[in-house]
């Protein structure tokens, strides 16, 4: 029976900067029941807080809701593991809410053929930014990623869209059905998941020349 | 205890390419963004680039978008800068640094350095 | 970019004194400044973060104060070990970039 091993918080995720959730993973149990309190101060503080809810984001996590998320200050915060027989602490984490932004995927995907009588046909692709991000208040700017491939097909055909909601794609198999893909990331943050798929049936008469 | 080993020290010509590695230990490779920073002899830092783990995603000094890879491989939690079209110029410590935390880049962890001489 | 310029160049300090440093960023940058110490054949050691915030287990004699352009780094007394190259970075806007460094030396 030995106290417990370091434990460690290795990810921060907020879907929209409103709330955020922490999750550690426990050291070595050491052969006891151990507990598990987070601690967190902001910069510029000496007051030690106490996670304010373990039970929203499930085990080994901290969610901070509403009251107790802010922006503009950066979170210092360490884990401690505790048995009969002693103690640890993870190495201190700090954590700015505006960098752990991890979005819903967009949605309404939209995919279309387009066969202008003047120009080559391409396949245009639109979408919408995700429901709980606010985009009119320039908190954030949204860079999105479409991914493409004929159904059979195994590799993806990635395309950096930026910041605009809508793209054409011009260079396509014809008479292949395609899976069409989106996701979105904050200028600072994380990817979101990809989108449910779209399928489109390219026109055997869709030319590239 | 948090790590960054590099590897060691490269004589390269002109026009030749290098990569230099950063292996990480101590913590989990995907949490935190991996930043490399140079020193040339007897002159300050300049920011290269850096690159999150988790997918790879990276941001470079438009100054080196030409030239500079940064790749990472999980399963070895190392990171890799590769620079290309060699001049004497680049000779200089090519550092990686760990970002200080899950927010701006400021660089907590920094590995020993790794000397790049440039000579034909 | 955002060109950060540190002076003086070299100070020369004797042991037990206070040190002023400091570093004047060429745009707007908020709070977003760094200071790093840097010692011969050594990688650089944060100090301050976000202007004014010393960083886990930094003595209580390095502060950093400033904001919007100039930023300060003071050592309220000098020990032997502080003797080294200090720079401060912003990272306000791409790319992260530093300053030219202020030596301090042992008067």
């Known amino acids: 029976q030995l106290p417990p091993g370091k434990p460690e918080i290795f990810k921060c995720r907020s879907p929209n900067k409103e709330t955020f959730t922490c999750w550690w993973r426990p050291g070595t149990d050491g052969g006891l029941p151990t507990n598990y309190s987070l601690t967190y101060h902001r910069e510029g503080e000496t007051l030690m807080h106490e996670c304010p809810d373990y039970i929203t984001g499930g085990p080994n996590s901290c969610h901070f809701g509403k009251q107790y998320t802010s922006m503009w200050r950066t979170y210092i915060m360490m884990v401690n593991a505790t048995n009969q027989m002693g103690s640890s602490f993870s190495d201190e984490l700090y954590v700015d809410v505006t960098y752990i932004v991890q979005p819903d995927p967009p949605l309404e995907l939209a995919v279309e053929v387009k066969q202008p009588e003047d120009r080559k046909p391409y396949l245009w692709i639109k979408w919408s930014p995700p429901t709980l991000i606010d985009l009119k208040t320039g908190w954030f700017t949204l860079l999105y990623e479409i991914r493409l491939k004929p159904e059979k097909a195994a590799e993806w055909e990635i395309h950096f869209a930026g910041q605009q909601t809508e793209f054409k794609i011009l260079s396509l198999h014809p008479g292949q059905k395609y899976l069409v893909q989106v996701r979105c990331k904050p200028d600072h943050g994380y990817w979101s998941a990809w989108s449910p798929a779209t399928f489109i049936q390219i026109p055997s008469d869709f030319t590239m020349n | 205890e948090v790590q960054l080993v590099q590897s060691g020290a490269e004589v390269k010509k002109p026009g030749s390419s290098v990569k230099v590695s950063c292996k990480a230990s101590?913590?989990?490779?995907?949490?935190?963004?991996m930043h490399w920073v140079r020193q040339a002899p007897g002159q300050g830092l300049e920011w290269i680039g850096e690159?999150?783990?988790?997918?790879?995603?990276?941001n470079y000094n438009q100054k080196f978008k030409d030239r500079a890879t940064l790749t990472v491989d999980k399963s070895t939690s190392t990171a890799y800068m590769e620079l290309s079209s060699l001049r004497s110029e680049d000779t200089a410590v090519y550092y990686c640094?760990?970002?200080?935390?899950?927010?701006?880049?400021?660089?907590?962890?920094w590995g020993q350095g790794t000397l790049v001489t440039v000579s034909s | 970019e955002i060109v950060m310029t540190q002076s003086p160049a070299t100070l020369s300090v004797s042991p037990g004194e206070r040190a002023t440093l400091s570093c004047k960023a060429s745009q707007y940058v908020g709070t977003a400044v760094a200071w790093y110490q840097q010692k011969p054949g050594q990688a650089p050691r944060l100090l301050i973060y976000s202007a004014s915030n010393r960083y886990t287990g930094i003595p209580a004699r390095f502060s950093g104060s400033g904001s919007g352009t100039e930023f300060t780094l003071t050592i309220s007394s000098l020990q032997s070990e502080d003797f080294a190259v200090y720079y401060c970075?912003?990272?306000?806007?791409?790319?992260?970039?530093f300053g030219g460094g202020t030596k301090v030396e042992i008067k």
């Open positions: 970075q912003q990272y306000s806007s791409y790319p992260w970039t």
């Open positions: 690159i999150d783990p988790s997918d790879s995603y990276s």
């Open positions: 640094a760990r970002n200080g935390g899950l927010g701006p880049a400021w660089f907590s962890y």
């Open positions: 101590g913590y989990t490779f995907t949490t935190y963004w």
